[in-house]
């Protein structure tokens, strides 16, 4: 269970308990909310008792015997109200949440395009990256623009495992590697020299790179080839 | 009079103190029950090896698994027999792929490979059944009537299926449903 919320309420408590108004999103959160209320109440109780102990002598000096009792009753009354609210919250909320969860899970099951996490709908997630697996064929430059319009980059491959995975998903696709001519080095989209072996590099006409089943090949930048986009999480 | 007032206040504070204590113990019990309920309530457990993502109506997959439409898929690069594949998926707290529809794996639709899926023929029910015991929809693979019932089914994500000896080695796909 994520106890961050509890730690937060212990250490970084704001002057007034507005956090309690936050709507719990789920069962876990509703319990956290209640824990925060309790922690806040306990902190207030400690503070109040400290105040009371500190001012004890002055009350007696002024000879107002009912004042401390009134203060205690007031504090206890507030604590009772808070505790009562907590009990009601904990009794009422889970049942409505379960109901809501059951309804939403029914709805979600019927949706076709459910999607995961931080990736756009219809993208796939793999090893902390989102991938748009395109089916359309484009030139290298068109592919670059298409990915940019999707707030992502033309496919880049960081390691062997990712390359093998992408080769399984799709037999060939553009990658974000190019050169200005055969006399220039292959570079990535951020201008770094690209050292991985690219087959057919000696052909002066082929200045854009393609992933093709576990190897990289050079291709004509004007060829229409499937493209994929990538966005690191 | 002052003494009476003091006694009254003490009585009230005593009563409130007792109420506070009882409310506190009630709250403690309720919290304990809620946590217990949380740990055994299946509706709230996202499943093995999966962690809930923050700010998400969905969940994240294990490393080296693909997340797509709230499912996690393990796409093997190794080739195994159908039974080996089934056991490997089970060891990952998942099962061999059960298809809801033929475009379920449309992110792999340009793949040329065939993969073992969780479909086998039940002599007892005289029907093709998925791993969970549900029957194969006749609309999923139009050619399923021609499948050899002694064989297992390999599927290509562009929608084709074929029957092969269960002892043949193929790649396989495991699936974990997150919802």
């Amino acid at each position: 269970m994520d106890n961050q919320g509890v730690i937060y309420s212990d250490l970084n408590l704001p002057p007034n308990p507005k956090r309690q108004q936050r709507k719990p999103k789920g069962n876990k959160n509703s319990i956290l909310a209640t824990e925060q209320e309790i922690t806040y109440a306990e902190l207030n109780l400690q503070k109040a008792s400290q105040d009371f102990q500190g001012n004890d002598k002055t009350y007696h000096c002024k000879d107002l015997p009912s004042a401390p009792e009134k203060l205690i009753v007031g504090i206890l009354g507030i604590i009772c109200l808070i505790l009562m609210a907590s009990v009601v919250t904990i009794v009422v909320i889970p049942s409505t949440l379960i109901q809501r969860h059951n309804n939403s899970s029914l709805n979600t099951r019927t949706q076709k395009a459910r999607h995961c996490g931080h990736c756009p709908e219809e993208w796939i997630t793999y090893s902390n990256s989102c991938y748009y697996i395109g089916k359309e064929r484009r030139t290298w430059e068109e592919s670059l623009l298409a990915c940019t319009s999707k707030n992502s980059s033309l496919l880049s491959i960081d390691n062997e495992e990712e390359m093998k995975f992408l080769s399984i998903i799709s037999p060939s696709s553009w990658i974000g590697v190019f050169r200005n001519s055969s006399h220039h080095p292959w570079v990535t989209m951020n201008g770094l020299a690209f050292k991985h072996e690219i087959k057919d590099s000696d052909n002066a006409e082929l200045n854009c790179a393609v992933l093709q089943v576990n190897r990289l090949k050079s291709a004509q930048c004007g060829s229409s080839i499937i493209y994929h986009c990538k966005h690191k999480l | 009079m002052a003494v009476f007032k003091t006694t009254l206040w003490r009585l009230i504070s005593g009563t409130l103190g007792i109420i506070c204590l009882s409310l506190m113990s009630t709250l403690g019990i309720l919290l304990k029950n809620s946590f217990t309920k949380l740990s055994i309530e299946p509706a709230f457990t996202p499943g093995p090896n999966i962690e809930l993502q923050k700010d998400s109506d969905c969940c994240s997959c294990q490393e080296k698994w693909v997340g797509y439409r709230c499912n996690c898929y393990f796409i093997s690069s190794e080739q195994k027999t159908w039974n080996e594949s089934r056991h490997l998926c089970a060891s990952q707290k998942s099962s061999l792929l059960q298809l809801q529809n033929t475009d379920e794996l449309d992110f792999m639709s340009s793949s040329q490979q065939f993969y073992w899926i969780g479909l086998s023929y039940s002599e007892e029910h005289t029907a093709w059944l998925w791993e969970n015991g549900s029957a194969l929809s006749q609309y999923l693979f139009p050619s399923f009537e021609t499948f050899n019932t002694k064989n297992c089914i390999a599927y290509n994500p562009n929608g084709n299926a074929l029957d092969e000896s269960c002892e043949d080695k193929n790649r396989y796909i495991c699936k974990q449903q997150l919802i």
């Epitope: 491959i157 080095p185 050292k195 590099s201 | -």
Partner: antibody, heavy 121, light 107 residues
Framework: EVQLQQSVAELVRPGASVKLSCTAS????????MHWVKERPEQGLEWIGR????????EFAPKFQGKATLTTDTSSNTAYLQLSSLTSEDTAIYYC??????????????WGQGTLVTVSA | DILMTQSPPSMSVSLGDTVSITCHAS??????IGWLQQKPGKSFKGLIY???NLEDGVPSRFSGSGSGADYSLTISSLESEDFADYYC?????????FGGGTKLEIK
């Protein structure tokens, strides 16, 4: 076609320096790493070092640090090995090699034909 | 430095035989090994990279295997052009180091 062309032989005096060249064709040296290896009949093969022609970064075997200098000229697609303060121990065949580098797998796919360096008075 | 111990230093074999040459590294090298061929008076040619992968144009009778610190090159059904010197090279860490070589001779 990938080729690495080296000069055939060099005869040099002890204490002098020599600069060996390795001209590549069929690929751009900036896209790979260029290595140099020393071969002597009794000692076998010894790796001297490598250079990244894209930025001039070098790695050396400890015994060749100070003895060998690696440079490149990207305009002529050529890698150079300079050996200084030559002694009879430096008499050997020197090979240049192109590193194959591809997502975790390395190796030498292509080699020059070697330059025989003879240090003699 | 990683020491590469190659064996045997030489072997006499017949055409059609299957031979294995082994290399032992002084520490684990995680398949970061290549195998090279050198014909008399000629330069080197890469045969195998990353322990098991064949370089382009290398016949399939050559194969590499092994893990950890022990690796081998196997040549099945030897042909006349296979009689040459063979070396292993490790590239797990700098400096790269070579085995002492194996001379394959016709019996």
């Amino acid at each position: 076609e990938v080729q690495l062309q080296q000069s055939v032989a060099e005869l040099v005096r002890p204490g002098a320096s020599v600069k060996l060249s390795c001209t590549a064709s069929g690929f751009n040296i900036q896209n790979t790493y260029m290595h140099w290896v020393k071969e002597r009949p009794e000692q076998g093969l010894e790796w001297i070092g490598r250079i990244d022609p894209a930025n001039g970064d070098t790695e050396f075997a400890p015994k060749f640090q100070g003895k060998a200098t690696l440079t490149t000229d990207t305009s002529s697609n050529t890698a150079y090995l300079q050996l200084s303060s030559l002694t009879s121990e430096d008499t050997a065949i020197y090979y240049c090699g192109r590193e194959r580098y591809f997502y975790g797998s390395r190796g030498f796919a292509y080699w020059g034909q070697g330059t025989l360096v003879t240090v003699s008075a | 430095d990683i020491l590469m111990t190659q064996s045997p230093p030489s072997m006499s074999v017949s055409l059609g035989d299957t031979v294995s040459i082994t290399c032992h590294a002084s520490q684990g090298i995680s398949s970061n090994i290549g195998w090279l061929q050198q014909k008399p008076g000629k330069s080197f040619k890469g045969l195998i990279y990353h322990g098991t992968n064949l370089e382009d144009g290398v016949p399939s009778r050559f194969s590499g295997s092994g893990s950890g610190a022990d690796y081998s090159l196997t040549i099945s059904s030897l042909e006349s052009e296979d009689f040459a010197d063979y070396y292993c090279v490790q590239y797990a860490q700098f400096p790269w180091t070579f085995g002492g070589g194996t001379k394959l001779e016709i019996k």
